[in-house]
């Protein structure tokens, strides 16, 4: 929802968290603001305190329940409001009717581990975290490998077009240190975006055997 120079963007992690960012040019840094969530068909509502993340933007997480509980469904609509205190009163600064499963951003994949490493290849696995059972197998992943002397931005993206929680990296250099990251995205949702990148997994390929042609 955009009002003039105000921007209010929220994402649902598919289970029990809605993360919101509100930016407003010229807003007072010390103003107390909150996000209020009112589902259309639920008995609960939730509030979180907006905290500054930059000069003109604030963020907060609406914790709807325990991390793996399915707190919203595909047919829920949540009214989200930014409310700021003005003296003794609260003023509404932004509002949106939020369809959770059209605005998804999952948690970063976790539990990255090296399953098997050789001189030229490495098999890596991971797990998805707090992802709804709704998605079945309809998720996609992007992965990238950091090679020596390069930046993450230079790393080519590898796309896995199905729910495949492992990858076999090929054509690696022996006895070389690498890092690996992966992110996930459901197919569902018009405004759905990629999860954050996972924590990097560092690994080293095995040295080439002496006297052998590699």
């Amino acid at each position: 929802a955009v009002n003039g120079t105000s921007r209010f963007t929220c994402f649902y992690n598919s289970r029990a968290n809605i993360s919101c960012v509100w930016s407003q040019d010229g807003a007072l840094q010390d103003t107390s603001c909150q996000v209020h969530a009112w589902p259309d068909r639920r008995r609960w509502n939730q509030t979180c305190e907006l905290l500054p993340v930059s000069q003109a933007s604030w963020a907060c997480n609406l914790i709807l329940g325990t991390p793996d509980s399915q707190k919203l469904t595909a047919v829920d609509i949540v009214t989200l409001r930014v409310m700021c205190r003005e003296g003794v009163r609260w003023r509404m600064m932004a509002i949106q009717d939020f369809k959770p499963f059209e605005n998804l951003r999952l948690m970063a994949p976790i539990s990255l581990q090296v399953v098997h490493v050789e001189t030229h290849r490495c098999n890596i696995s991971w797990k998805i975290s707090q992802a709804s059972h709704y998605f079945e197998r309809h998720l996609e992943f992007e992965a990238r490998t950091l090679s020596p002397g390069h930046t993450w931005e230079e790393a080519p993206l590898m796309t896995l077009k199905q729910k495949q929680e492992w990858i076999c990296l090929e054509t690696l250099t022996p006895d070389t240190q690498y890092e690996f990251q992966v992110r996930v995205k459901p197919l569902q949702g018009e405004f759905t975006t990629w999860s954050p990148w996972s924590q990097p997994l560092a690994f080293r390929t095995k040295p080439a055997a002496l006297g052998k042609d590699t």
Epitope: T73, E136, Q188
Partner: antibody, heavy 117, light 107 residues
Framework: EVQLVQSGAEVKKPGATVKISCKVS????????IHWVQQAPGKGLEWMGW????????EYAPGFQDRVTITADTSTDTAYMELSSLRSEDTAVYYC??????????WGQGTTVTVSS | EIVMTQSPATLSVSPGERATLSCRAS??????LHWYQQKPGQAPRLLII???QSISGIPARFSGSRSGTEFTLTISSLQSEDFAVYFC?????????FGQGTKLEIK
């Protein structure tokens, strides 16, 4: 292999109630959604509702919610659809299906219900 | 309730030729459109999700596309087993609704 096996054909009188079962195998029933869809002659496919076995919630289409009840028995991996106050236009094939909320990935073989006096 | 309109109601095509089936939504549904195939006496089978994503195990000759509220299912080279009824279904607004179907028959 994912399988949904439905109970057999039913003949009912107007005003009666029918209860159809859908026994599933090949996937985790406790973490699934089971949908029910009606296919009446000349009316095409109509989505009736679903049960979310993990969240323990049901969702019904407005056109059916007064007369339909969807339940599940997680001890036997079986879902049920009960349709009450039957009328002639309820004569149809009824399907159970597994899917997320948005589309139906696997279907049962269908159960024919005939409503006739 | 969103109305899904499929056209034509019946399409006659020769084996080996291309078939193009259309589905139009009565309002904007983003890419929340899914295609099914149904053969006589059988349950529907999911072919394509979100307008253009093929389901694993579905032959590559089936493809989907979208232009605004109009969605197209294309079968590039018809095989004998492709003659069936095809349904579209929207999942943008509750309740989810199906088109009335297009019957694809042998010419």
């Amino acid at each position: 292999e994912v399988q949904l096996v439905q109970s057999g054909a039913e003949v009912k009188k107007p005003g009666a109630t029918v209860k159809i079962s859908c026994k599933v195998s090949g996937f985790n029933f406790k973490e699934s959604l089971i949908h029910w869809v009606q296919q009446a002659p000349g009316k095409g496919l109509e989505w009736m509702g679903w049960i979310d076995n993990e969240a323990g919630e049901t969702e019904y289409a407005p056109g059916f919610q007064d007369r339909v009840t969807i339940t599940a028995d997680t001890s036997t991996d079986t879902a049920y659809m009960e349709l009450s106050s039957l009328r002639s236009e309820d004569t149809a094939v009824y399907y159970c299906a597994r899917g997320g909320p948005w589309f139906l990935s696997y279907w049962g073989q269908g159960t024919t219900v005939t409503v006739s006096s | 309730e969103i109305v899904m309109t499929q056209s034509p109601a019946t399409l006659s095509v020769s084996p080996g030729e291309r078939a193009t089936l259309s589905c139009r939504a009565s309002q904007i549904i983003s890419n929340n459109l899914h295609w099914y195939q149904q053969k006589p006496g059988q349950a529907p089978r999911l072919l394509i999700i979100y307008g253009l994503q093929s389901i694993s195990g579905i032959p590559a000759r089936f493809s989907g596309s979208r232009s605004g509220t109009e969605f197209t299912l294309t079968i590039s080279s018809l095989q004998s087993e492709d003659f069936a009824v095809y349904f579209c279904q929207q999942s943008n607004n509750f309740p989810y609704t199906f088109g009335q179907g297009t019957k694809l028959e042998i010419k």
